[in-house]
């Protein structure tokens, strides 16, 4: 009797452990979204970037939603958020309107329940892109650890969007859940 | 009988839990590799950096392999990858040939099964390092979340490798597994 | 008998699983500390930043301690550490003492047992902030994966602290535990 219970227990335990491991390691939300170069807005002021790939190349998403240019949280938790934004200009693209540029990124959280928007992270640089050089490039990286609630939305705003590098390795943002909320 | 089974169960469960926790928290692969300054290549174009420390100072590795200048994935999963690359020039460092520099990093994934190489992340800046200043410095940071398969390799390419800062706190890259693949 | 044991087992197992999940996902230490702008030191050389918020806005801490300007580790483990530091100057703030600036961050680990301090990560840039532009901005981001022991302390040093951007989305640092030590 005792031997039978032990064997059965081990078998059930195994499946519990499997379930525990699977629920922990596989259900954790994440996203890595890469810029959709066919739909970059123009302008030099702060602009929200709404067109991102989530299902091609390095783009991917799981247990989060991408809708209307925003990354939507489906599961409460503490997440690590990051963004990498590259800007570039080649003299063959034409003259810049100004040599003094403010190249910035803002990672923003919007709460639908209480309609409000807050900047979680910002980064960038003022640059002097003179005509003495035929090519200019600059990248920004930001990252941080934030408490996100289900329904909250993450979006990316940049200055000078027409200067964005459209490569998937250059301009992207993402998130992954690290921990539950106590 | 029932009391004996309960006690035995708690004991066995404890070890299962212990095993579950250990397998989750301790077997997760990671690496943090710091530049080996004794073997930095020369060149101005994109150069692969093959010499890194994985076992001294801040350098460390677990459940991943470092071989032939590449970080090899041993366990399928979603990983957070990062790199920090610092460039510097002092007037005593040598005769800098140009003030206009393209200081770049490329984090690359190579698949052996299908021999191909793809850039996962890039960052950097064009810089004007004039002789009016005796010292120049610039750092790049990139990071992102990627699906990696066992056998795939991560490598780092930079421009102007002779300008690299050889300190372990300056020039490094790494990875840690966050999640299994569904 | 066998049915009763099975039901009891499922109940006990459930609580074990719950405990396992809670101990894993909720007890993992983290911190995200944002600059306290009311107490930024002056000077242009390397200065330790000791005033940070851990309990307002985006600032938060769990299973770590913030004391005397340092983030104290309470639990051995491998942690991902990060910092984002923004510098800015507007002509209305007054003239800069010099147009040639070294804008740097150093993320430092101090061990109390063996009184010593080591730089884990550094980043930054030399900048030429000329009077031709009314506004200047620059951000640094660094991040890396490090083994930390209970009692060790993390602190942030910067150059030119008077140029720091005091916004919580601009100047912050943090850590989260990823993995136990084997």
């Amino acid at each position: 009797g005792s031997q039978h219970i032990r064997a059965e227990k081990a078998m059930v335990d195994g499946s519990w452990l499997d379930l525990a491991k699977r629920s922990k390691l596989e259900a954790q939300p994440f996203a890595h979204l890469t810029i959709n170069a066919t739909d970059i807005p123009s302008g030099s002021h702060k602009v929200s970037l709404s067109s991102w790939y989530h299902d091609r190349g390095w783009g991917k998403i799981s247990n989060m939603t991408f809708s209307n240019g925003k990354l939507i949280v489906n599961q409460d938790g503490f997440y690590y958020l990051y963004a990498n934004i590259c800007f570039r200009h080649h003299e063959t693209s034409g003259d810049l309107a100004t040599e003094y540029l403010q190249l910035m990124v803002y990672v923003t959280k919007t709460s639908i329940k209480i309609p409000s928007s807050h900047t979680l992270m910002k980064g960038g640089s003022t640059k002097y892109w003179s005509g003495n050089s035929e090519f200019h490039f600059y990248s920004i990286n930001v990252g941080g650890f934030f408490k996100l609630r289900s329904g909250e939305e993450i979006s990316i705003e940049v200055s000078n969007p027409s200067l964005l590098d459209p490569d998937q390795d250059a301009t992207y943002f993402g998130a992954f859940k690290v921990r539950d909320i106590d | 009988g029932s009391q004996h089974i309960r006690a035995e169960k708690a004991m066995v469960d404890g070890s299962w839990l212990d095993l579950a926790k250990r397998s989750k928290l301790e077997a997760q692969p990671f690496a943090h590799l710091t530049i080996n300054a004794t073997d930095i290549p020369s060149g101005s174009h994109k150069v692969s950096l093959s010499s890194w420390y994985h076992d001294r100072g801040w350098g460390k590795i677990s459940n991943m392999t470092f071989s032939n200048g590449k970080l090899i994935v041993n366990q399928d999963g979603f990983y957070y990858l990062y790199a920090n690359i610092c460039f510097r020039h002092h007037e005593t460092s040598g005769d800098l040939a140009t003030e206009y520099l393209q200081l770049m990093v490329y984090v690359t994934k190579t698949s052996i099964k299908i021999p191909s190489s793809h850039t996962l992340m890039k960052g950097g800046s064009t810089k004007y390092w004039s002789g009016n200043s005796e010292f120049h410095f610039y750092s790049i940071n990139v990071g992102g979340f990627f699906k990696l398969r066992s056998g795939e390799e991560i490598s780092i390419e930079v421009s102007n490798p002779s300008l690299l800062d050889p300190d372990q706190d300056a020039t490094y890259f790494g990875a840690f597994k966050v999640r299994d693949i569904d | 008998g066998s049915q009763h044991i099975r039901a009891e087992k499922a109940m006990v197992d459930g609580s074990w699983l719950d405990l396992a999940k809670r101990s894993k996902l909720e007890a993992q230490p983290f911190a995200h500390l944002t600059i306290n702008a009311t107490d930024i030191p002056s000077g242009s050389h390397k200065v330790s930043l000791s005033s940070w918020y851990h309990d307002r806005g985006w600032g938060k801490i769990s299973n770590m301690t913030f004391s005397n300007g340092k983030l104290i580790v309470n639990q051995d483990g491998f942690y991902y550490l990060y910092a984002n530091i923004c510098f800015r100057h507007h002509e209305t703030s007054g003239d800069l003492a010099t147009e040639y600036l070294q804008l740097m961050v150093y993320v430092t680990k101090t061990s109390i047992k063996i009184p010593s301090s080591h730089t884990l990560m550094k980043g930054g840039s030399t900048k030429y902030w000329s009077g031709n532009s009314e506004f200047h901005f620059y951000s640094i981001n660094v991040g890396g994966f490090f083994k930390l022991r209970s009692g060790e302390e993390i602190s942030i040093e910067v150059s030119n602290p008077s140029l720091l951007d005091p916004d919580q989305d601009a100047t912050y640092f943090g850590a989260f535990k990823v993995r136990d030590i084997d």
Partner: antibody, heavy 122, light 107 residues
Framework: EVQLVESGGGLVKPGGSLRLSCAAS????????MSWVRQAPGKGLEWVAG????????YYPDTVKGRFTISRDNAKNSLYLQMNSLRAEDTAVYYC???????????????WGKGTTVTVSS | DIQMTQSPSSLSASVGDRVTITCKAS??????IAWYQQKPGKAPKLLIY???YRYTGVPSRFSGSGSGTDFTFTISSLQPEDIATYYC?????????FGGGTKVEIK
């Protein structure tokens, strides 16, 4: 066609001065570091000055430091060498040479002018 | 300063011969060596850089090898138009220094 043409050489007395010029054509001059290399009669080659592409860095060996000044005008695609306090041992053919692209700290020369002769004699 | 010692100072060989010139640096220069050809009354021409890389348009009979302090320049099959003086140059650290030259003649 990529070309470098030197001028300004001649006969000068010891202690005198001379200014050499080099006119560049056929390439984007502002993108390249440049040098002057000399060759004494029947002797080997000696590097005497270098200048970065933007002109803010200048380099010299000890033999000419303080006496020679290299400069450039990127708008005019021109390189110069101002030589003061000339000595008999400065007698040589002076070549203008373009530094090839490569490691930013390493200088070798892929395009050379035909040279201009400087004779220092009383 | 890094001294470059070239040998031999002159050599005579027949058309079709394999010709080898050596260059020794006074300290380690890794692979930072260039080789030039200079014909009488003409400017030098770059043949090899970084010890073994042939410059654009240079015939394949010219090759270079070596690292550290010892370097070799080879003409695999000497041609009449190869009559010239050959110089090595270290491009490792300033001041940029040249070898004394090797004069190659036809027997």
């Amino acid at each position: 066609e990529v070309q470098l043409v030197e001028s300004g050489g001649g006969l000068v007395k010891p202690g005198g001065s001379l200014r050499l010029s080099c006119a560049a054509s056929g390439f984007t001059f502002r993108n390249y570091a440049m040098s002057w290399v000399r060759q004494a009669p029947g002797k080997g080659l000696e590097w005497v000055a270098g200048i970065s592409s933007g002109g803010t860095y200048t380099y010299y060996p000890d033999t000419v430091k303080g006496r020679f000044t290299i400069s450039r005008d990127n708008a005019k695609n021109s390189l110069y060498l101002q030589m003061n306090s000339l000595r008999a041992e400065d007698t040589a053919v002076y070549y203008c040479a373009r530094r090839d692209y490569g490691d930013v700290y390493e200088w070798y020369f892929d395009v050379w002018g035909k040279g201009t002769t400087v004779t220092v004699s009383s | 300063d890094i001294q470059m010692t070239q040998s031999p100072s002159s050599l005579s060989a027949s058309v079709g011969d394999r010709v080898t010139i050596t260059c020794k640096a006074s300290q380690d220069v890794r692979t930072s060596i260039a080789w030039y050809q200079q014909k009488p009354g003409k400017a030098p021409k770059l043949l090899i850089y970084s010890a073994s890389y042939r410059y654009t348009g240079v015939p394949s009979r010219f090759s270079g090898s070596g690292s550290g302090t010892d370097f070799t320049f080879t003409i695999s099959s000497l041609q009449p138009e190869d009559i010239a003086t050959y110089y090595c140059q270290q491009h490792y650290s300033s001041p940029w220094t040249f070898g004394g030259g090797t004069k190659v003649e036809i027997k």
